[in-house]
């Protein structure tokens, strides 16, 4: 960066090199060049010469003033016009940054994705700070009172092997940057209550010719959790509103869910699950598309083969659930 150049003087910023966005700032340049009394001192921002708000302070120093500085980053350097020099002489440079102090982190969430071996903690960092902001995640055992701290720039994965202080913990997040520091409320967790089952995946779909044609969705999860509640949502791709079916599921076999759908329409399906009675859901699975046939032939769609047509007969046992209408997004 500009900060690594060899200097023949000094450049500094008031109030500081990192400052709150929208502040008035002064950039000072002081030349220290052998046998060069600068006739003029020039400032450059991102390589472009500044022409206004420059004041000569004394023989070797000038000040550049900015009102309401809003750029997140800028490279500043200054030069001197030395007598008998055809080119300006570089004095020094500095990278400057503006931004905001961190907001109080909120919506602190910690989950254990089944088989991951990690507890993943996330939070809402609030508004963009524009400057380097670090987060310290504090994890304190309620049984041993031992506290561990983890430094990160965003979320954190904590190995469950390192959580040796029993099952109950307090978790909170400290956010800090050059402009300030804030701390979240404490979240109390029990490790057994924050497990999210292994991802549920829709593998294929087929529409069976019957008196009333029906579509069967095949889906599965590798979870070992016995009591799992799932939701499947679906809609025509032209619609805004999701329909949601709820299931109490046992994943000892592939799940099959039946739907009575309109012919010749492209539908999209997603599924998600949670351990029954617990707080956290999986994220919705990736979109699975299926187009119902115009008339009676059987149609099969497979995951990641969107809009493909396959023939073949399958007899299946069907999981049925409760149908609701859903405008919800992904619920954590």
């Amino acid at each position: 960066g500009i900060t690594n150049i060899n200097c023949s003087g000094h450049i500094w910023v008031e109030p500081a090199t990192i400052f709150k966005m929208g502040m008035n700032i002064s950039i000072y340049c002081q030349a220290a060049i052998k046998n060069c009394q600068p006739r003029k001192l020039h400032f450059y921002k991102n390589g472009i010469k500044e022409r206004f708000q420059i004041t000569r302070i004394n023989k070797t120093t000038a000040r550049l003033w900015y009102k309401n500085f809003l750029e997140p980053h800028a490279s500043m350097y200054c030069t001197a016009e030395c007598p008998k020099h055809f080119q300006e002489t570089l004095i020094c440079g500095k990278d400057i940054s503006s931004g905001y102090p961190p907001d109080i982190p909120d919506e602190v969430t910690c989950v254990i994705y089944e088989y991951s071996g990690n507890m993943t903690c996330t939070w809402n960092a609030g508004k963009l700070t524009y400057i380097d902001t670090k987060y310290v995640v504090h994890v304190k055992s309620l049984e041993t009172e031992e506290e561990q701290q983890y430094l990160t720039s965003s979320y954190i994965n904590i190995s469950t092997d390192s959580l040796q202080g029993g099952k109950k913990y307090l978790v909170w997040v400290q956010a800090a940057n050059a402009l300030g520091m804030e701390e979240s409320k404490q979240l109390q967790i029990h490790l057994d209550d924050i497990v999210i089952p292994s991802a549920a995946v829709i593998s294929r779909a087929e529409t069976i010719n019957a008196t009333v044609p029906k579509t069967i969705i095949y889906w599965d999860s590798q979870t070992t959790i016995e009591k799992v509640s799932c939701e499947m949502r679906y809609k025509a791709t032209t619609n805004q509103t999701w329909n949601v079916k709820e299931f109490d599921t046992n994943f000892t076999y592939v799940q099959q869910s039946e739907f009575y759908l309109e012919p010749n329409i492209k539908y999209v399906f997603q599924v998600r699950c949670q351990e029954t009675g617990k707080r956290y859901w999986q994220p919705w699975s990736s979109l699975f598309f299926h187009k119902t046939p115009e008339t009676v032939p059987q149609v099969t769609s497979k995951a990641f083969q969107h809009d493909t047509w396959n023939s073949g007969l399958t007899v299946a046992s069907i999981s049925t659930g409760h149908l609701t209408s859903d405008n919800r997004g992904d619920i954590g």
Epitope: A32, Q37, R39, K84
Partner: antibody, heavy 117, light 107 residues
Amino acid sequence: QVQLVQSGAEVKKPGASMKVSCKVSGYTLNELSIHWVRQAPGKGLEWMGGFDPEHGETVYAQNFQDRVTLTEDTSTDTSYMGLNNLRSDDTAVYYCAAESYGDYEFWGQGTLVTVSS
Amino acid sequence: DIQMTQSPSSVSASVGDRVTITCRASQGINNWLAWYQQKPGKAPKVLIYTASSLQSGVPSRFSGSGSGTDFTLTISSLQPEDFATYYCQQANSHPWTFGQGTKVEIK
């Protein structure tokens, strides 16, 4: 173009003080490094002191360290050289000069100061 | 302090002559050397700066050379207006110092 105009000749008694002015035009005083050089009758040039831009300070020749004071008034772009406790061998022409990359490109016209009882 | 020694202290020459004046520094001054011409009752005038750079407006018959401790001012073909006293001056370190001068006289 820099122009340096000095104050007029002076006659001083031994032990007295003097102050020679040097008015700058063409540039501001903040854009120039003013030095002072003197020349006794029939003798060579002798550097007295001036502003050092590399270190941001006024420096003086050791011979004059205790007796000379260089000051500036940036509001009038005038530089001053004061010399106290004058002796007869301080009789000289005193020049202000604008330093320009290790040399003096611009000089004042000189001020003759005669120290005589 | 750095001592500057000029030689010769005076030189008699005719118009058209080549004149060489030398200046020796008591310690190395890189190329921080200037040469001046001074005529009676006038302020000095810079001829050469940084040992070999010709000051704007100065005739090309004047040239400077050298670095470190030994420096030379050469007037390739002396003209009537060149009869004057010449000084060298170092600007490597404070206090800046002048040579004692070389007077170029008409032979």
